[in-house]
């Protein structure tokens, strides 16, 4: 059964910058990745980026750059323009649509004790209930 992992890290150089990394572990070909914050896509979350392996990417503020890292993982850079960072306590969710297995989603947030530049290891996370 496919699994999705999510990790969020604060950039060491810029405390207002965060990066969300997401990956898909499983068979099938990925046809779409959707990244949202504040909850899952379609269940209270707000879309930040959509990545299609052939048609390209779309992103919405405060997303700065969405890109494929490998054939089965992506990264999304976020820029917080405000004085205080809202990202630290925010949940980020990644949904991978894979053919023919379907859609698989997981959510994550910055670990509470995170030092800038450090992040949780990219261990597989089972599909999480978000509601």
């Amino acid at each position: 059964t496919p699994e999705v992992w999510v990790q969020v890290q604060m950039e060491a150089t810029e405390l207002s910058s965060f990066t969300v990394h997401c990956g898909f572990l499983g068979p099938g070909s990925i046809s779409l990745v959707t990244v949202s914050w504040g909850g899952p896509d379609g269940a209270g979350g707000t879309k930040l980026a959509v990545l299609h392996p052939e048609l390209g990417t779309r992103q919405w503020a405060p997303a700065r750059q969405a890109r494929w890292e490998t054939q089965s993982s992506i990264s999304l850079a976020l820029e917080d323009s405000g004085a205080s960072s809202p990202f630290a306590n925010t949940t980020f969710c990644c949904k991978f649509a894979s053919f023919p297995e379907g859609s698989w989603e997981s959510c994550g947030s910055l670990p509470p004790s995170s030092d800038p530049g450090l992040s949780a290891p990219p261990t597989p996370v089972p599909i999480l209930r978000a509601d």
């Epitope: 779409l32 023919p100 599909i127």
Partner: antibody, heavy 120, light 107 residues
């Protein structure tokens, strides 16, 4: 409004083939996978297979891999299913259903069904 | 293949009743459980996806719950238009499989 309009009922002879259609409207056809489901009279639902309209990739239930062929025509936003070597066991209502593209992997919109009767 | 079992094939209730329909999977399906209704004319509609999320346009009297292998659909205040057959479906693995259905009738 999402709609899936299926072709009308058919009566066919044993051994023949039949090709039914499912015309999609109200959404971008290539953005959502399409499922096909069989319902024999008074019985439950059986999943036949799924097709990705974007590239035509298919995946079938082993039970139906030699019975059904799924195709799409992107220009008309239409999905097709062809059933071959028909027998009385193939008499049923066949539904197309759009994949929700969401966790749970539900089928969020369904066609009205195409009734197939196999009789000599 | 994962077997989906709806032990109650038919259920009678009165308008206004709270009705619960159950579904069991032959293995853990991690909330990848969906509920549909089929009207007597054959029309099929999605009610609940991912165990408990309400599909758009579905009245709030419908709710879903469960985890692991056991799931349920609840109709909190039965209305005449709810008379239908209800199916569960797992979206956890291929092939997708459905329960046998529970036909809901009015007393």
């Amino acid at each position: 409004e999402v709609q899936l309009q299926q072709s009308g009922p058919v009566l066919v002879k044993p051994g023949a083939s039949v090709k039914m259609s499912c015309k999609a409207s109200g959404y971008i056809f290539t953005d959502y996978y399409m499922h096909w489901v069989k319902q024999s009279h008074g019985k439950s639902l059986e999943w036949i297979g799924i097709i990705n309209p974007y590239n035509g990739d298919t995946s079938y239930n082993q039970k139906f891999k030699d019975k059904a062929t799924l195709t799409v025509d992107k220009s008309s936003s239409t999905a097709y299913m062809e059933l071959n070597s028909l027998t009385s066991e193939d008499s049923a209502v066949y539904y197309c259903a759009r994949d929700s593209s969401n966790v749970g992997n539900a089928m969020d919109y369904w066609g009205q069904g195409t009734s197939v009767t196999v009789s000599s | 293949d994962i077997q989906m079992t709806q032990t109650t094939s038919s259920l009678s209730a009165s308008l206004g009743d709270r009705v619960t329909i159950s579904c069991r999977a032959s293995q853990d399906i991690s909330n990848y459980l969906n509920w549909y209704l089929q009207k007597p004319d054959g029309t099929i509609k999605l009610l609940i996806y991912y165990s408990s999320r309400l599909h758009s346009g579905v009245p709030s009297r419908f709710s879903g719950s469960g985890s692991g292998t056991d799931y349920s659909l609840t109709i909190s205040n039965l209305e005449q238009e709810d008379i239908a057959t209800y199916f569960c479906q797992q979206g956890y693995t291929l092939p997708r499989t459905f329960g046998g259905g529970t036909k809901l009738e009015i007393i």
